[in-house]
């Protein structure tokens, strides 16, 4: 990437690392509003299977691991990058390391949720205080969970999905704050490991994954209210893997695997239509990407 | 029934390249994780290369890397090991073996293997 | 990368006999071993998995152990057919290695 500094623009979705052939140190950003992808300061170290979220303008990349020729290292890093200087910088490690993990964001603090080290499947979860930086651990999830899909809805932290170690999960769960305990709530109509999971609307929206058997194109979501889970226009392309963010109240899904191809394509769902459409592609294709978006 | 099935094996001069398959029936290579294992002759198990059905993730041996491809092919139900720049020590039958996750890795249906020999 | 110290590299045994091999990981692997029967000419067969777990269709006869980094393959009571090579393979983290084999001769 370019070591230039970032045009001072509005709202990004930032795509970091991935994997293609080995992990990547890629990060780039769309800007929705005229298409346009600008390629920005590489991750010091590659890694896929990372998460990504914003606190405070600040984007940060947490675990994941370097898979590359040279061997294959799961990560605890935590890395922040300024849009204002296009420069990482590291911060505390998490506990232990973390791939495939899934993180959200509640009142300025990070969550890193499940994730494996080895053959060890977290049920583990921490919280990073950025004013600190430190990482302190929270109850542990009631399930073991790696590519877990994790958002964060009315100050509660959801953990959706994922594969235990011996099986993938339909399984869902809720995380209290304020009580520092995890809830089971409904299980998915559908087996999802390494979907895409975000909130739009005041529902939890879970999309794609692999359930075993393929990977899948179907997207569900869940309303708090009705406490449901309820199926919503599927997406053109199957996948697992896959990078998601919503962006001006439609979600946006990168790239993932297919089961073939490392795909490049990104979609884009409107509520109000219950439709997906292809919006634009990445430079190039990739799963085990890390996404989120600037705030205004 | 599983079965899984080698071809492709053979004579091959130094710095040649091969290519190996793994048919397989009986289940879906997209429901597990492939690996290909390697035998010299007169000697141990040596793990080559894995792909990841979830992810598409591949990981190699470091004796191996850069000059080894594994791929799979869901469609035809198949998977590869496109093996480049081979050397003597890569002398081997090579066996694609399936691990169920559930196994912790642990590869519960093999080929019946396949040899490679690299000599001038 | 992790060591998977096997030993003994070769045994003599009667049918009938109680035969243990074991291996020693240079570090710690959890739980994440597995060991394999093979026989000249034929692809390894799995016997166990998760350092204890008996695979399915294998006799009851085989059993898994571990004692921290230690782990143990028992035969309880030899049969003719259990003659061959024993491997040991980890799998908790990358690369994933084997034993050098213990090879189980008829006395």
């Known amino acids: 990437g370019s070591m230039g500094h970032a045009p001072k623009v509005g709202r990004l979705i930032y795509t970091a690392g991935g994997y293609f052939r080995q992990s990547l140190s890629y990060l780039e950003a769309y800007n929705p509003s005229d298409g346009t992808w600008l390629d920005l300061a590489d991750l010091q170290v590659p890694r896929s299977g990372l998460a990504g979220c914003v606190v405070g303008g600040l984007l940060y990349a947490v675990g994941g691991r370097n898979n590359s020729p040279d061997g294959n290292t799961d990560s605890s890093a935590l890395d922040c990058y300024n849009p204002m200087t296009n420069q990482w910088s590291p911060c505390a490690p998490m506990s232990v390391p973390r791939n495939r993990i899934g993180v959200g964001v509640i009142d300025g603090h990070i969550y890193a949720v499940g994730g494996s080290h080895g053959c060890i499947h977290h049920n583990s979860v921490e919280r990073y205080e950025p004013e600190r930086d430190e990482w302190h651990l929270v109850a542990p999830m009631l399930t073991r969970r790696i590519g877990v899909g994790v958002a964060v809805l009315n100050r509660l932290l959801y953990a959706v999905g994922g594969f235990d170690g011996t099986n993938r999960l339909n399984s869902a769960e809720c995380y209290y704050p304020e009580r520092n305990e995890w809830r089971m709530i409904t299980a998915m109509n559908t087996i999802r490991s390494g979907a895409g999971v975000c909130v739009l609307h005041n529902c939890i929206y879970a999309a794609g994954g692999y359930d075993g058997q393929d990977q899948l194109n179907s997207v569900e979501r869940y309303d708090v209210e009705t406490e449901t889970w309820t199926f919503v226009a599927p997406m053109k392309h199957r996948r697992s893997a896959l990078g998601i963010t919503v962006h001006q109240g439609r979600i946006y899904v990168l790239g993932g695997y297919d089961g073939h191809t490392f795909l490049d394509s990104v979609e884009c769902y409107d509520p109000d239509t219950d439709t997906w459409s292809e919006v634009t592609r990445m430079t190039s294709g990739r799963s085990g990407v890390g996404v989120a978006v600037t705030m205004e | 029934e599983v079965q899984l099935v080698e071809s492709g094996g053979g004579l091959v001069q130094p710095g040649g390249s091969l290519r190996l398959s793994c048919a397989a029936s009986?289940?879906?290579?997209?429901?597990?994780?492939i690996h290909w294992v390697r035998q010299a002759p007169g000697k141990g198990l040596e793990w080559v290369a894995s792909?990841?059905?979830?992810?598409?993730?591949?990981l190699y041996a470091k004796s191996v890397a850069g000059r080894f491809t594994i791929s799979a092919d869901t469609s035809k139900n198949t998977a590869y090991l496109q093996m480049n720049s081979l050397r003597a020590e890569d002398t081997a039958v090579y066996y694609c073996?399936?691990?169920?996750?559930?196994?912790?890795?642990?590869?519960?249906?093999w080929g019946q293997g396949t040899l490679v020999t690299v000599s001038s | 990368d992790i060591q998977m110290t096997q030993s003994p590299s070769s045994l003599s045994a009667s049918v009938g006999d109680r035969v243990t091999i074991t291996c020693r990981a240079s570090q710690s692997v959890s739980s994440a071993v597995a060991w394999y029967q093979q026989k000249p000419g034929k692809a390894p067969k799995l016997l166990i998995y998760?350092?204890?777990s008996l695979y399915s269709g294998v006799p009851s006869r085989f059993s898994g152990s571990r004692s921290g980094t230690d782990f143990t393959l028992t035969i309880s009571s030899l049969q003719p057919e259990d003659f061959a090579t024993y491997y040991c393979?980890?799998?908790?983290?990358?690369?994933?290695?084997f034993g050098q084999g213990t090879k189980v001769e008829i006395k």
């Open positions: 009986g289940f879906a290579i997209s429901a597990s994780s």
């Open positions: 792909i990841d059905p979830e992810t598409g993730e591949t």
């Open positions: 998760s350092a204890s």
């Open positions: 393979q980890q799998s908790y983290s990358f690369p994933s290695t």
């Open positions: 073996a399936r691990a169920e996750s559930g196994n912790v890795a642990a590869a519960d249906y």
